[in-house]
């Protein structure tokens, strides 16, 4: 056979149906690989060619479109399951070609099991709700095209094996659930049945999505450095190691960049010459708030480094801050004879730096190290 | 470690109420369902109805519609079965039962309350 | 509502020996079938969901198969603290159901 363009196993594609459950597959040529569609294709004469290969085989061997009751069929560049079997997880390619051009290309299909609670080894959207934000809304995802507008499903929506009725806060209406007022106790997994009648035969369509109460923007507020601040002094004496926490609050902010960074004389430690280490620790709340802390480190100060300036910087949509840290060479304590009377050791506890601890709050802890030199 | 705790045992007439409660210790932060179901004499288990605390939601059995109501109090952790319009027949032990989630199938009755004794009798 | 009916109401055994206990759906239910345990004056205790996976605790002696419509609990060596009734419970469709029970007595 004649050369033809092979795109190879499209990964970024990893589709998965559930088990005896419609599916419409498009071939994935004509949405990323090129710059035509399947009409313009088909009116130029090329046709569309399906094949697979089974799991854990290397044989590609046709499609069988001449099942019972057309279990699997082709229209346009769509591959229809009507339904699936476990047997049918694959790598499917589909192929256009004429005589004088050919492209091709792979995808993996997997078919996956459900239990009666809807637990499977699906990969779930996240859909994010603002915490008492007002009436949202979340819908039955991927279910256009299987059925036609003048046919009317009926559409039962779960939260986990528990079917949404009598709920406080959440109403099911058709293919939406409408969250009155979003609160921690909505987080979960929630699923739509989509039932419709097609040729005599009744499907389902079963769609789960995970729901994530976060932090909304009425509450939103621009980054909030808790430390260092004017409460604490660090006072060191050469050769002693200088730790200095960077700790930032930030709201939640729906595509937000969070930003903490230390600034030393005004550069970026990257850009000078002292031996420091960042180390970052990243915290979640449960409405996704995000606590990032920067400790700045020293192995062993200088005179020199204990007169720098050392300045805390963080940013997000919301705006820019920036904190400078207090640090101060200790002082020697006067040596006192005898006769000049105790009672000063107390002295030495005052000009002590304070120490500092260091509270991770619950949720991921992400830990970066960076070495400056 | 969950616990679910009932109230003691009733001894009703016909054509009164009971209300049972069923209290839960080291609830976990994720939403549950509290299950009721019953016991009569010597016969097998029969569920009623479930309550999701945190949430409101609830369901019952079509048998008991009309004259069971579960509700439940978050701020005690306590869920309540309450049957009306009781009969003789009702006279059975009264279990409440809970899992860890929503979404654990098969795993909603992996905990049970010790069970109250309802006597209907005249 | 799905009927789950449990075979034998009451299965008699020694001590030592195997005993088996079938439930049959009146239709299908997947894998989605738990049997408890009841001893008198006691709650039920989940033994086995899934069909055939043993909740926490819960010794290897029990075992669970089947799917679809048949089931079955198999003790595979009978200890004194066996000796119980034995339910099976479909939560494949609501209502969920309740089997009659089979009541394994000292032969």
């Known amino acids: 056979s004649e050369r033809c363009d092979d795109w190879g196993l499209d990964t970024m594609r990893q589709i998965q149906v559930f088990e005896d459950e419609p599916a419409r597959i498009k071939c994935p040529l004509f949405e990323h690989f090129l710059k035509f569609n399947y009409s313009t294709a088909h009116s130029a004469g090329l046709t569309l060619i399906w094949y697979w290969t089974r799991q854990d085989r290397d044989l590609e061997e046709p499609i069988n479109f001449r099942l019972p009751e057309n279990r699997i069929s082709k229209e346009k560049d769509v591959l229809w399951f009507r339904p699936t079997l476990l047997n049918d997880t694959g790598n499917y390619t589909c192929m256009l070609r004429n005589t004088t051009y050919c492209s091709k290309v792979a995808f993996p299909l997997e078919v996956v099991q459900k239990d009666s609670c809807f637990n499977s080894p699906m990969k779930l959207p996240v859909h994010k709700l603002y915490i008492e934000y007002g009436i949202q809304r979340i819908t039955c995802p991927n279910v256009d095209g299987y059925f036609p507008s003048s046919v009317k499903p009926t559409i039962t929506w779960y939260m986990g094996c528990y079917k949404i009725q009598n709920f406080n806060n959440v109403i099911p209406e058709g293919m939406n659930l409408s969250f009155l007022i979003a609160l921690i106790s909505n987080n979960g997994n929630y699923t739509c049945v989509v039932t419709y009648p097609e040729n005599g035969r009744t499907f389902h369509l079963t769609r789960t999505l995970t729901v994530k109460v976060v932090g909304s923007p009425k509450n939103a507020v621009p980054p909030v450095i808790h430390s260092p601040n004017d409460h604490v002094v660090y006072e060191k004496e050469p050769g002693e190691e200088l730790l200095i926490p960077c700790t930032v609050y930030f709201s939640f902010l729906m595509d937000s960049r969070n930003e903490v960074w230390w600034t030393i004389d005004g550069k970026k430690p990257d850009d000078i010459t002292i031996d420091v280490t960042i180390n970052e620790s990243i915290s979640h709340s449960r409405t996704e708030d995000e606590t990032r802390t920067q400790i700045l480190s020293i192995k062993k100060v200088t005179s020199e480094d204990l007169k720098r300036s050392y300045v805390c910087h963080a940013r997000s949509a919301k705006g820019e801050v920036a904190k400078a840290a207090k640090v101060k060479q200790k002082v020697p304590a006067p040596r006192y004879t005898v006769e000049g009377g105790g009672g000063t050791g107390g002295l030495n506890d005052i000009f002590e730096a304070q120490k500092i601890e260091w509270h991770e709050g619950g949720g991921h802890h992400h830990h970066h190290h960076h070495h400056h030199h | 470690q969950v616990q679910l705790v009932q109230s003691g045992a009733e001894v009703k007439k016909p054509g009164s109420s009971v209300k049972v409660s069923c209290k839960a210790s080291?609830?976990?932060?994720?939403?549950?369902?509290i299950q009721w179901v019953r016991q009569a004499p010597g016969q097998g288990l029969e569920w009623m109805g479930y309550?999701?605390?945190?949430?409101?939601?609830?369901d019952y059995a079509q048998k008991f519609q009309g004259r069971v109501t579960i509700t439940a109090d978050e701020s005690t952790s306590t869920a309540y079965m309450e049957l009306s319009s009781l009969r003789s027949e009702d006279t059975a032990v009264y279990y409440c039962?809970?899992?860890?989630?929503?979404?654990?199938?098969?795993?909603?009755?992996?905990?049970w309350g010790q069970g109250t004794l309802v006597t209907v009798s005249s | 509502e799905i009927v789950m009916t449990q075979s034998p109401a009451t299965l008699s055994v020694s001590p030592g020996e195997r005993a088996t206990l079938s439930c049959r759906a009146s239709q299908s239910v997947s894998s989605n079938l738990a049997w408890y345990q009841q001893k008198p004056g006691q709650a039920p205790r989940l033994l086995i969901y899934g069909a055939s996976t043993r909740a926490t605790g819960i010794p290897a002696r029990f075992s669970g198969s089947g799917s679809g419509t048949e089931f079955t609990l198999t003790i595979s060596s009978l200890q004194s603290e066996d000796f119980a009734v034995y339910y099976c419970?479909?939560?494949?469709?609501?209502?969920?159901?309740f089997g009659q029970g089979t009541k394994v007595e000292i032969k």
């Open positions: 419970q479909q939560y494949n469709n609501w209502p969920w159901t």
């Open positions: 309550i999701i605390p945190s949430l409101g939601g609830y």
């Open positions: 080291g609830s976990p932060a994720e939403p549950y369902a």
């Open positions: 039962a809970r899992g860890q989630t929503l979404y654990d199938s098969g795993r909603q009755f992996d905990i």
